[in-house]
Interface confidence: low
């Protein structure tokens, strides 16, 4: 799996999970989230050569096509596969609210 | 929806469905498929600016992050959303076989 266990331990130019810390205020301009101040969102990036963690038959076809036609703009892309929620604390007036924001943290990647 | 109805009628630099005909023999080196000789596979390509057909909360966060940090390599990618199968005819010896290859045709796209 293209997850932290593999990707963070290997120097990998191909599609893999990359670490990314997002500070809500600085990076997103969000001032409404009280806690946490930021989180490890991570992201997916890297090349998608033939058969590198292809998601569908179409992405396998596309990566093979791209091998034969390397200048064509038709190629698979490295995107998130498994995502996890993030629990946040914010205030409505003086009332604290705890909420779970779905699909906020990328745990693994795929070529799609 | 970023499908043929919208994308093929508009000049769109942002994430959209793009037409792509794949010839099995020429483009993939596949000689085993008897019919069809090729098919309209299509592909997804284009920029993913903030809120352009974002797939998940993470992709929305990432596109906003990318707006504020344009030099960062962390940005969503335009990938396939809805896929359809393709029916093919091939031979095992002299015996014709009809099979449906799943997820071969892209029908719409998303920013993920």
């Amino acid at each position: 799996a293209l997850d932290a266990a593999y990707c963070f331990r290997n120097v990998q130019d191909n599609c893999c999970l990359r670490p990314l810390y997002i500070d809500f205020k600085r990076d997103l301009g969000w001032k409404w989230i009280h806690e946490p101040k930021g989180y490890n969102a991570n992201f997916c990036a890297g090349a998608c050569p033939y058969l590198w963690s292809s998601d569908t038959q179409h992405s396998r076809v596309l990566s093979l096509y791209n091998t034969i036609n390397p200048e064509a703009s038709a190629s698979p892309c490295c995107v998130s596969q498994d995502l996890e929620p993030l629990t946040i604390l914010y205030y409505i007036g003086k009332t604290p609210k705890i909420e779970q924001l779905s699909n906020m943290i990328v745990k693994s990647c795929k070529c799609s | 929806a970023l499908d043929a109805a919208y994308c093929f009628r508009n000049v769109q630099d942002n994430c959209c469905l793009r037409p792509l005909y794949i010839d099995f023999k020429r483009d993939l080196g596949w000689k085993w498929i008897h019919e069809p000789k090729g098919y309209n596979a299509n592909f997804c390509a284009g920029a993913c600016p903030y809120l352009w057909s974002s797939d998940t909360q993470h992709s929305r966060v990432l596109s906003l992050y990318n707006t504020i940090n344009p030099e960062a390599s962390a940005s969503p990618c335009c990938v396939s959303q809805d896929l359809e199968p393709l029916t093919i005819l091939y031979y095992i010896g002299k015996t014709p076989k009809i099979e449906q290859l799943s997820n071969m045709i892209v029908k719409s796209c998303k920013c993920s």
Epitope: N69, E71 | F8, A45
Partner: antibody, heavy 125, light 112 residues
């Protein structure tokens, strides 16, 4: 209409660095490969290299590290830099895109279309 | 490194005559058909006539035709018109080669 236009200094001194720009209109550099090709006066065409839609640059073996191709998709510009120029680099420099067939790029077919009109570069002191 | 050799260097013919131009590659072009033909007139950029060895570009008169496969290719102009007198170049596309593309030296078709 899809067009390319080269620009740069007409005259460069020997040993200097030549910088050329190819400005494109009517299509996105995020989706297409752009090639640089040159033609010395009265001679044939020489493929220098290309920058792919994804930003990867490839060069002809004879380009021997003196050429650098880059792009700025937001400005719709592709640039060519040539270091330590000599009189042998005097030529008309063209940028050309891979053509499209049925809405899809043709890849390695050597099908260059459209082309820019070209810009003449003279290396002389 | 692939080398494309065009012959003859100069072809002297009269309007209405048939022109046959040859292009030979030192190694097979990719897919046996990644070969294009260009026409160039003084002070102008080259114009793509034929790609894929035999496919005419839109707007090119059908007196032009291309044939060949692998390493040997031919451009034929069935009946020369006054506007056909120009220099013709072939170009090959190569896969896995250090040079993706190569141009032939050109054939000048001049009025006899």
């Amino acid at each position: 209409e899809q067009q390319l236009q080269e620009s740069g200094p007409g005259l460069v001194k020997p040993s200097e660095t030549l910088s050329l720009t190819c400005t494109v209109t009517g299509f996105s550099l995020s989706s297409y490969t752009v090639n640089w090709i040159r033609q010395p006066a009265g001679k044939g065409l020489e493929w220098i290299g290309y920058i792919s839609y994804g930003g990867s640059a490839y060069y002809a073996s004879w380009a021997n590290g003196r050429f650098t191709i880059s792009k700025d998709s937001s400005k719709n510009q592709v640039s060519l830099k040539l270091s330590s120029v000599t009189a042998a680099d005097t030529a008309v420099y063209f940028c050309a895109r891979h053509m499209q067939v049925g809405g899809a790029p043709t890849g390695s077919m050597a099908a260059f279309d459209p082309w820019g009109p070209g810009t003449l570069v003279t290396v002389s002191s | 490194e692939a080398v494309l050799t065009q012959s003859p260097g100069t072809l002297s013919l009269s309007p209405g005559e048939r022109a046959t131009l040859s292009c030979q590659s030192s190694q097979s072009v990719y897919n046996n058909n990644y070969l294009s033909w260009f026409q160039q007139k003084p002070g102008q950029p080259p114009r793509l006539l034929i790609y894929g060895a035999s496919t005419l570009t839109s707007g090119v008169p059908d007196r032009f035709s291309g044939s060949g496969s692998g390493t040997d290719f031919t451009l034929t102009i069935s009946r020369l018109e006054p506007e056909d007198f120009a220099v013709y170049y072939c170009a090959g596309g190569y896969s896995g080669s250090s040079d993706k593309y190569a141009f032939g030296g050109g054939t000048k078709v001049e009025i006899k």
